[in-house]
């Protein structure tokens, strides 16, 4: 049950959550298994239930305290294992000495909004979540909006390449409905990866004036 | 470019000791876990030691266990190897190899190595 090809991955959100992923090729579905966290600078231990998510993996959120409060920083080691039970044992099927701020994954941005829209042009703007006070403005986004009769992978992506937190939309057709998400990712880390999409917000261009040419 | 340069091999009697090195460079090597493993003549590679990227997480193969410590100094990008009561059978071709990431996998300790060195002969003879 537990030979297969196995991946660890873990990410922390720059506040009080490290979210792991666990899968293994071959293994059984009601195994037990659990991520144990051991900080090397800090007075708590942590454990949370690997659940699955799919055939062959699981998924579980180390949460460290209050959303919005600043459990680790830059110095500080994590020490995560994945243990599993076999029999009346645990055995350790993976380890890492975690350092969290290279490996971040911020939580989607939040509360988009359309701040003005026209017949060819949309200002949104959003706000990021449980976001570090310590990336200052040392973060990324990209977006993309969604037009009628595509799909959100044919989407071209906009990277805004600074700390902005609204895109003005040009070139819309007017009197058309479109969807928007964007994605953030900070700077710092190795490992870090961009954040999942947002919701996507919906909204619609102003159709043209009439007699007026467009 | 990704380097590593194992030293400290040589020639020495059974029970005896030595300290083997691995000098890294080319990557953020406190990011990384680390292994040691050896080829003895006519054999394959057979897993020795790893170890996680600040050290606190060991693991050794049965034949070596108590016998090696793997250790690392970050500040150094260095890794390191004491063998002690070193028997013939030991003797091999030892290298340090890098793991992918951050994670080992102590069920299958050969599994996610990136990058080996060209590795250092130590051979336990009388």
């Known amino acids: 049950a537990v030979n297969g090809t196995s991946q660890f991955t873990c990410f922390y959100n720059s506040r009080a959550n490290i979210s792991c992923v666990w899968s293994q090729d071959g293994a059984l579905q009601d195994t037990s298994c659990q991520v144990h966290a051991w900080p090397d600078r800090r007075r708590w231990n942590q454990t949370c239930e690997l659940l699955p998510v799919s055939q062959a993996s699981w998924a579980c959120n180390l949460i460290l305290g209050a959303p919005d409060s600043q459990k680790l920083t830059t110095v500080d080691i994590v020490t995560l294992r994945v243990l599993c039970r076999e029999g009346v044992r645990w055995r350790v099927m993976a380890i890492q000495d975690f350092k969290p701020f290279e490996n971040l994954r911020l939580m989607a941005p939040i509360s988009l909004q359309v701040v003005h829209v026209e017949t060819h042009r949309c200002n949104i703007s959003w706000e990021i979540s449980q976001a570090s006070h310590y990336f200052e403005r040392h973060l990324e986004f990209e977006a993309r909006t969604l037009s009628p009769g595509h799909t959100w992978e044919e989407a071209p992506l906009l990277t805004l390449k600074q700390k902005q937190e609204w895109i003005c939309l040009e070139t819309l057709t007017p009197d058309t409905q479109y969807e928007f998400q964007v994605r953030v990712k900070p700077l710092q880390g190795e490992f870090t990866t961009w954040s999942p999409w947002s919701q996507p917000l919906a909204f619609r261009t102003k159709p043209a004036a009439l007699g007026k040419d467009t | 470019q990704l380097q590593l340069v194992e030293s400290g091999g040589g020639l020495v009697q059974p029970g005896g000791s030595l300290e083997l090195s691995c000098a890294a460079s080319?990557?953020?090597?406190?990011?990384?876990?680390m292994s040691w493993v050896r080829q003895a003549p006519g054999k394959g590679l057979e897993w020795v030691s790893s170890?996680?990227?600040?050290?606190?997480?060991?693991d050794y193969a049965d034949s070596v266990k108590g016998r090696f410590t793997i250790s690392r100094d970050n500040a150094k990008n260095t890794l390191y190897l004491q063998m002690n009561s070193l028997k013939p059978e030991d003797t091999a071709v030892y290298y340090c190899?890098?793991?992918?990431?951050?994670?080992?996998?102590?069920?299958?300790?050969?599994?996610?190595?990136?990058?080996r060195g060209q590795g250092t002969q130590v051979t336990v003879s009388s």
């Open positions: 190899a890098r793991y992918s990431s951050s994670t080992y996998y102590p069920p299958t300790p050969a599994r996610g190595r990136d990058y």
């Open positions: 080319g990557f953020t090597f406190s990011n990384y876990a």
């Open positions: 170890i996680t990227g600040f050290g606190r997480g060991t």
